[in-house]
Interface confidence: low
Amino acid sequence: QHTCSISKVTSLLEVNCENKKLTALPADLPADTGILHLGENQLGTFSTASLVHFTHLTYLYLDRCELTSLQTNGKLIKLENLDLSHNNLKSLPSLGWALPALTTLDVSFNKLGSLSPGVLDGLSQLQELYLQNNDLKSLPPGLLLPTTKLKKLNLANNKLRELPSGLLDGLEDLDTLYLQRNWLRTIPKGFFGTLLLPFVFLHANSWYCDCEILYFRHWLQENANNVYLWKQGVDVKDTTPNVASVRCANLDNAPVYSYPGKGCPTSSGDTDYDDYDDIPDVPATRTEVKFSTNTKVHTTHWSLLAAAPSTSQDSQMISLPPTHKPTKKQSTFIHTQSPGFTTLPETMESNPTFYSLKLNTVLIPSPTTLEPTSTQATPEPNIQPMLTTSTLTTPEHSTTPVPTTTILTTPEHSTIPVPTTAILTTPKPSTIPVPTTATLTTLEPSTTPVPTTATLTTPEPSTTLVPTTATLTTPEHSTTPVPTTATLTTPEHSTTPVPTTATLTTPEPSTTLTNLVSTISPVLTTTLTTPESTPIETILEQFFTTELTLLPTLESTTTIIPEQNSFLNLPEVALVSSDTSESSPFLNSDFCCFLP
């Protein structure tokens, strides 16, 4: 009687000896075994010589066998798949001679500290190589030269500080590269060569953004649709690109793809991509939306372009359902901008909660204007292109409402300015009204002149404790307060400098809301400068305190709508959480300092 179970589902005889407390190969294995499972045994050491007479052997599973040593002293010429994962291997012997037909090699979750230069020599058929979760600190040059058919390479969760510049040379079939969770500071210039990699994972490294990062920055911009955030148990094809997951460790975790690189030397011989940083600026704007949610016990600041580095980036980053699939062909118009993504705050209690909505719009006028074209073409290098579509969703296990959707879309080119809209809503089944949807629609810059002045009139603050509407008006135009919205608008069809009108209102509670007490104190801080050469900066902040009990039907919406001729281009909006233990919102930096 066989110790192991035997079946023949395919043309190969499959023998399963898993978890049989084996310390050696069983003596009664069928000679025509094609698939052999030896996982979860206590083999300690293993020699391929013990399997040479199994002439059918195609798949060999030696995972979780407490292996400390592997000897390749017998040739298994038909072996295509070898699983050595979850063992205690500190080194790998040369495999090519013994395993010339190997197509998949899994040595993940071992204790490999280094690899010898010729360890993969002879593995000309290798298509998948899994080395994640080891202790690799470096890789030998030429490691992958013998494996020209490689399609998948996983080096995640190691201690790699740098990569050999020619690591990927010749790997024309490579389609998936995992490099997340290492100690990488930069990517060597030319590292990716001309490879078109549909799936790349680069997050949770120590990317150091200085002039050396420019090659990598531009590669990210050019390949924004192919950079993903890895999520346990989720197939890469079921996720959505997340280029903003690649962050500068030295710049408050700002996305690498948006690193400005100002002051960096540029010469055609120095970088592959970045020879255009000196091109004159065109009109550009930057809108920052900031949310702060503070509870008595726990404070979470939804702030821009910063991620809490202390927690697991794989779990904290919100993944994206697919809006499109990457292709190996590059489109003529590369949409490179993408929102940053949030960390997930811990589950918050229903305590008195302070909210802050901060709109910071910076208009940078310039004599240069853009003539929109009828076809999509790559913009001049200094123009920040826009991401057409990306979506953000909350992981199912999260109980904290967080901003969960960010959609950026670019309408077709038009010479008529079109509104730029941001909509933020909360989900119904929530214990705390935290914005959960942000929709941003952006356009190519309009040819209409940019206003250089703005007039804002602030009304006297209401003396009531619970005002429901605060309205900012101009002499010529006012906007009717709209319940549940905060709206920033400008008059339509204006050709002269446009005064700004803003309406701020609190979300109206639904009829099922109980025990709602609101204290609202809107504050407007405006900095206006008139010379064309200087930016116009308007900072609009609204703070209010709410102690509440929410039922599932509650829904509130905050809308920020710059109307026509507002010239707001929103190339970059990022919502990221950072946590503090401060209980008072007024000790929070968001509250401390109002600009004069």
Epitope: D32, H56, K75, T103
Partner: antibody
Framework: QVQLVESGGGVVQPGRSLRLSCAAS????????MSWVRQAPGKGLEWVAS???????YYPDSVLGRFTISRDNSKNTLYLQMNSLRAEDTAVYYC????????????WGQGTLVTVSS | DIVMTQSPDSLAVSLGERATINCKSS????????????LAWYQQKPGQPPKLLIY???TRESGVPDRFSGSGSGTDFTLTISSLQAEDVAVYYC?????????FGGGTKLEIK
Amino acid sequence: QVQLVESGGGVVQPGRSLRLSCAASGFTFSSFAMSWVRQAPGKGLEWVASITSAGTPYYPDSVLGRFTISRDNSKNTLYLQMNSLRAEDTAVYYCARSRGYEDYFDYWGQGTLVTVSS
Amino acid sequence: DIVMTQSPDSLAVSLGERATINCKSSQSLLNSRNQKNYLAWYQQKPGQPPKLLIYFTSTRESGVPDRFSGSGSGTDFTLTISSLQAEDVAVYYCQQHYSSPWTFGGGTKLEIK
């Protein structure tokens, strides 16, 4: 019945390349491993290359890195790409069907002569 | 690599008589797990490709006359033609299919005496 027909042989100079083809019929080509075996004039048989039904190739050391076996199941055709040819590669090259994974050869083609000479 | 050595190089036998060809391997071809010896025999007539006669030492390929038989174990093997026929004139090769690279013996030329 099973038929294997080789083509592509000829005279070639040392260092040059040649590609042999083997058209198969009379059996489900994609289900069988296939091989090339050669025979130098007046000499014995020498195994050159095999490829599994799944497309995995393997070779003896004498041709490893120089010869490449491949197959196109849609065309029922086996190939042998021979690069850096040497005088000692002169032989009749037979296409053969391998029985299962046991690597004995149950059907053979008539062969095609490759002569490597300057 | 496993080296296969055939003897004799050539053999002349009268029609109707028994012909015996030997093959020796440099290492055992016995798979102790299934007790099979991985040895095959081929017949090659002038101007023709080889033809499979026997595999696993003694299993006759379909269509092969039963006057052909194989025996042996480990490293020593024998092909026997019990009653030689005129159409049996050919060169006979043994081949080990135990371990790659698959190797052949040098061949034994069988003639009629």
